[in-house]
Amino acid sequence: MMTGTIETTGNISAKKGGSVILQCHLSSTMAQVTQVNWEQHDHSLLAIRNAELGWHIYPAFKDRVAPGPGLGLTLQSLTMNDTGEYFCTYHTYPDGTYRGRIFLEVLESSVAEHSARFQIP
């Protein structure tokens, strides 16, 4: 039985040209996290973090994505095209798969403030 819940940074906004941290956290389960996958709204993989083997950043994002902090992901040099949904998928044993959603809005405005909060989707 899957008892865990994914907490995410929820809906966030960040300035064009800036950077943003995408964070998910799995709680309320003793399941072992074997892998965390980060994906973009169009089903493109940004990165994979295998618990034992480490990080891989996918080719389309290798210049703009940095692993961490923790199991999170830092997206840099933001463009307007980065606006949209991002998903963290936690592969766990023995529970199975947990998925969290983050919505990122990239703002043109130079006064846009980065807002982030943890929330349960």
Partner: antibody, heavy 119, light 107 residues
Framework: EVQLQQSGPELVKPGASVKISCKTS????????MHWVKQSHGKSLEWIGG????????SYNQRFKDRATLTVDKSSSTAYMELRSLTSEDSAVYYC????????????WGQGTLVTVSA | DIVMTQSHKFMSTSVGDRVSITCKAS??????VAWYQQKPGQSPKLLIY???YRYTGVPDRFTGSGSGTDFTFTISSVQAEDLAVYYC?????????FGGGTKLEIK
């Protein structure tokens, strides 16, 4: 040029163990994950597990977890796979292979080591 | 475990033809798919990764596409040296798995 050189063929008895080596040359050994893949005669490929040479971290296919052990000797740029309690089902070619920079696809492969389990 | 199904075990084609090999995942695998070529008596060779990037030195007649659960590998103009078995491979979720292979035969 990156090369993965595997040890030679093995003929082993049922119940015994085998340890296969894979020496990397032509690149920094610790930069990439190393993996082992099984190919039974005329069959497809089966991932056994992978290893991070930097920290010795291992990820196993649950099917092999109890019988396979992946290790590494950084000083000689060599990865090892030990397989225990062998049966005829383990007769196969075993490949070591190296991950790419970008993802967990396998860019370089050893020549394969044929393991035959027979009484 | 995620099962990668290559519906055709064999495909027969002629030199110069265009041929497409399909691979279907039993569960969602995003874009974590690669394609390998294995010629008789040789080790597999990476052709396509992620799943539309050509690996270094791979001729541009080889292409890949797809995301989610459905993937396609295409040879735009088959050459005699393309006689081989082609495998798809997912690394979205461990254990990473391979398709059963499609053997390309030249008429």
């Amino acid at each position: 040029e990156v090369q993965l050189q595997q040890s030679g063929p093995e003929l082993v008895k049922p119940g015994a163990s085998v340890k296969i080596s894979c020496k990397t040359s032509g690149s920094t050994f610790t930069e990439y994950t190393m993996h082992w893949v099984k190919q039974s005669h005329g069959k497809s490929l089966e991932w056994i597990g992978g290893l991070n040479p930097n920290n010795g971290g291992t990820s196993y296919n649950q099917r092999f977890k109890d019988r396979a052990t992946l290790t590494v000797d950084k000083s000689s740029s060599t990865a090892y796979m030990e397989l225990r309690s062998l049966t005829s089902e383990d007769s196969a070619v075993y490949y070591c292979t190296r991950g790419t920079y970008y993802d967990y696809s396998f860019a370089y492969w050893g020549q394969g080591t044929l393991v035959t389990v027979s009484a | 475990d995620i099962v990668m199904t290559q519906s055709h075990k064999f495909m027969s084609t002629s030199v110069g033809d265009r041929v497409s090999i399909t691979c279907k995942a039993s569960h969602y695998v995003s874009t974590a798919v690669a394609w390998y070529q294995q010629k008789p008596g040789q080790s597999p060779k990476l052709l396509i990764y992620s799943p539309s990037y050509r690996y270094t030195g791979v001729p541009d007649r080889f292409t890949g596409s797809g995301s989610g659960t459905d993937f396609t590998f295409t040879i735009s103009s088959v050459q005699a040296e393309d006689l081989a078995v082609y495998y798809c491979h997912q690394h979205y979720s461990t254990p990473w798995t391979f398709g059963g292979g499609t053997k390309l035969e030249i008429k």
